[in-house]
Amino acid sequence: QPVGINTSTTCCYRFINKKIPKQRLESYRRTTSSHCPREAVIFKTKLDKEICADPTQKWVQDFMKHLDKKTQTPKL
């Protein structure tokens, strides 16, 4: 779980170590705050849960790319 260190900054201290099913994910955001000890990707699930992931892992990069494509494709 991401930890809020103040009202505007969220840091991740531990990363999920297993793949999340892609279809459960709604969106993501990157956390690159200089307050945080490590850079992270925070995935938001369809159930509104936030999950910290390691941005250097290939599956995390693939999931971000998948979500980018999803947001670029307008729903008809």
């Epitope: 990157r30 705050s33 200089s34 307050h35 850079e39 941005p55 971000m64 790319k65 980018d68």
Partner: antibody
Framework: QEQLVESGGDLVKPEGSLTLTCTAS?????????MCWVRQAPGKGLELIAC???????TYYASWAEGRFTISKTSSTTVTLQMTSLTVADTATYFC??????????????WGPGTLVTVSS | AYDMTQTPASVEVGVGGTVTIKCQAS???????LSWYQQKPGQPPKLLIY???TLASGVSSRFKGSGSGTQFTLTISGVESADSATYYC????????????FGGGTEVVVK
């Protein structure tokens, strides 16, 4: 007004060492920013070298700079770049830059004028 | 790797014209993670745009940033002679990978 000034640029021989200093005024590192060193060889583009968190001191380096360059926060208003085993290819203007706020994704809105490092025998 | 590539390397434009500069990332950097800078000879770069499309403080609305994923664009409309400069893009997606964070630059020459 917020300002960055680099110092320490010099003419140095190949294999020599040099330490550059970036001095901030008008703000202090108690507000967290990414402080970075960026260089520009004559007539060439911008190259990021290293960055440090002004609050907690976390550092990141370009892969080519790791081991030869060291970024440090030496006070609440100064950041240094130690450079070793310098080669002619390190000849450049070295800039100190600060992010707009604590996030990496907002770009560098504050730059120093630069300091020139010349490596030549 | 998030290597940034800019095209063209150089472009000539007449006063009042429009110039488009492209920046390509080697992998997707999302839609909010690109900055643009203007640099004039003998000066440090100046931040123009961050977050892909947000104008930095004091920057003219003639500068417009757009794009997402791997393709980004800086458009300068109603070009003025003062716009003669070199323009750089920079990825803001990851600080873990600093290599080639800046594009190679585009020199804009205003005729």
């Amino acid at each position: 007004q917020e300002q960055l000034v680099e110092s320490g640029g010099d003419l140095v021989k190949p294999e020599g060492s040099l330490t550059l200093t970036c001095t901030a005024s008008g703000f202090s590192f108690s507000t967290s920013y990414w402080m970075c060193w960026v260089r520009q060889a004559p007539g060439k583009g911008l190259e990021l070298i290293a960055c440090i968190s002004s609050s907690i001191g976390v550092t990141y380096y370009a892969s080519w700079a790791e081991g030869r360059f060291t970024i440090s926060k030496t006070s609440s208003t100064t950041v240094t770049l130690q450079m070793t085993s310098l080669t002619v290819a390190d000849t450049a203007t070295y800039f100190c830059a600060r992010t707009t706020d604590d996030n990496w994704n907002v770009g560098f809105n504050l730059w120093g004028p630069g300091t020139l490092v010349t490596v030549s025998s | 790797a998030y290597d940034m590539t800019q095209t063209p390397a150089s472009v000539e434009v007449g006063v009042g014209g429009t110039v488009t500069i492209k920046c390509q990332a080697s992998q997707s950097i999302g839609n909010r993670y690109l900055s643009w800078y203007q640099q004039k000879p003998g000066q440090p770069p100046k931040l123009l745009i961050y977050g892909t499309s947000t104008l930095a403080s004091g920057v003219s609305s003639r500068f417009k940033g757009s794009g997402s994923g791997t393709q980004f664009t800086l458009t300068i409309s109603g070009v003025e002679s003062a716009d003669s400069a070199t323009y750089y893009c920079q990825q803001g997606a990851t600080i873990s990978y600093l290599d080639n964070a800046f594009g190679g630059g585009t020199e804009v020459v205003v005729k």
